[in-house]
């Protein structure tokens, strides 16, 4: 499978709500014996492998945001401290994977990188990842909501292993 | 019957090396996860590492750069080579086989002293 | 790095007690990665629990598992004579890295 970034980068007022998302593309496999971890976390440009570094999201690391489920199932954080800051990210069944921001403020600015791990545990993992741009700007040439441009099919698909 | 032995344990000096093996008998090495862990003298059990099915390999994070786990599947046994050991790798090393979401068989161990 | 935290470390109790064991792991583990192990001297481990509340083939249903997140017990309903041991946990992880960690271990003493 793949991860697409449908949207590579999201322009948002201060205050604002924003959701961040990724999407599983391709043949999933959905075994008993599968399992997904799926989490989110900040990085930044100019590495030589996108997303190689670990940095977290309003002080919550990887393993805070993290959900890990069966390959047939849904989840969402449903903890204090990922709500307390203002996080929840969240699972579907269709291979939507995202992160809720609330109350963005100007330090929320940056790279975020969704990882995806494929876990047939003992036999195999398969690691993915995608990577957006989150701008969050003030002032009046601040927009009144979010803006988000999609990604290149390219970019969208452009998968390097994490 | 399915059964791990390990074996060359022994002796060592420190900054010596040693290659531990893990035959199995009674079923396929090359179908399960095979890991080693070892218990010092009196103290609790300690993960070394694993080689999964797909021969991923993944070592706890002392054990980088000294152990190197291998399998060699037409002589269904399993290796951990020890390099730059020292007296606190002194231990009983088991090799353990993954089964399911565990491990589920393990050896008997062998004993490995480093000492002057 | 990835504790396994295990609790108390000694338990001393009498054949017919209710034993409790506690394992608390410092990030969260997927419960089906979660076992417990017995130990008696000069022996290997064995497999008691997995997927934190499953029973291994051979063990007898005195033995329980439970928890999930962090948070994992085994309890032994009553004590019998051969359970007299030492105890561990055990929890894989795959974040960042493949790790297995084992807990401390608790031992189960006669009173």
């Known amino acids: 499978f793949k991860v697409a970034t449908p949207y590579s980068l999201y322009v948002c007022p201060e205050g604002q709500n924003v959701t961040l998302t990724c999407r599983l593309l391709g043949p999933v496999d959905k075994g008993h014996d599968v399992t997904f971890y799926k989490t989110w976390y900040r990085s930044s440009r100019g590495e030589v492998q996108t997303c190689s570094e670990r940095r977290p999201i309003r002080n919550l690391t990887f393993q805070d945001l993290h959900l890990h489920h069966g390959g047939h199932q849904a989840a969402n954080t449903s903890h204090d401290l990922a709500q307390r800051h203002g996080l929840e990210s969240a699972s579907d069944h269709h291979g939507n994977f995202s992160i809720t921001m609330r109350n963005l403020t100007l330090l929320d600015s940056g790279l975020y990188c969704c990882l995806v791990v494929e876990i047939r545990h003992h036999h195999s993992e398969h690691r993915v990842h995608g990577a957006m741009e989150l701008q969050v700007q003030t002032g009046k040439d601040a927009p009144s909501n979010c803006v988000v441009y999609p990604s290149s099919s390219q970019d969208s698909e452009n998968i390097t292993a994490a | 019957e399915v059964q791990l032995v390990e074996s060359g344990g022994g002796l060592v000096q420190p900054g010596g090396s040693l290659r531990l093996s893990c035959a199995a008998s009674?079923?396929?090495?090359?179908?399960?996860?095979m890991g080693w862990v070892r218990q010092a003298p009196g103290k609790g059990l300690e993960w070394v590492g694993i080689?999964?099915?797909?021969?991923?390999?993944y070592y706890a994070s002392w054990a980088k750069g000294r152990f190197t786990i291998s399998r060699d599947n037409s002589k269904n046994t399993l290796y951990l080579q020890m390099n730059s050991l020292r007296a606190e790798d002194t231990a009983v090393y088991y090799c353990?086989?993954?089964?399911?979401?565990?491990?589920?068989?393990w050896g008997q161990g062998t004993l490995v002293t480093v000492s002057s | 790095e990835i504790v396994m935290t295990q609790s108390p470390a000694t338990l001393s109790l009498s054949p017919g007690e209710r034993a409790t064991l506690s394992c608390q792991a410092s990030?969260?583990?997927?419960?089906?990665?979660l076992a417990w192990y017995q130990q008696k001297p000069g022996q290997a481990p064995r497999l008691l629990i997995y997927?934190?509340?499953t029973l291994a083939s051979g063990i007898p249903a005195r033995f329980s598992g439970s928890g999930s997140g962090t948070d994992f017990t085994l309890t032994i309903s009553s004590l019998q004579p051969e359970d007299f041991a030492v105890y561990y946990c055990?929890?894989?992880?795959?974040?960042?890295?493949?790790?297995?960690?084992f807990g401390g271990g608790t031992k189960v003493e006669i009173k």
């Open positions: 080689i999964i099915v797909s021969g991923n390999i």
């Open positions: 009674g079923f396929s090495l090359s179908s399960y996860a």
């Open positions: 055990q929890g894989t992880f795959y974040i960042p890295d493949y790790i297995d960690g």
């Open positions: 997927s934190a509340s």
């Open positions: 353990a086989r993954g089964d399911g979401y565990t491990y589920g068989l």
């Open positions: 990030q969260s583990v997927y419960s089906r990665y």
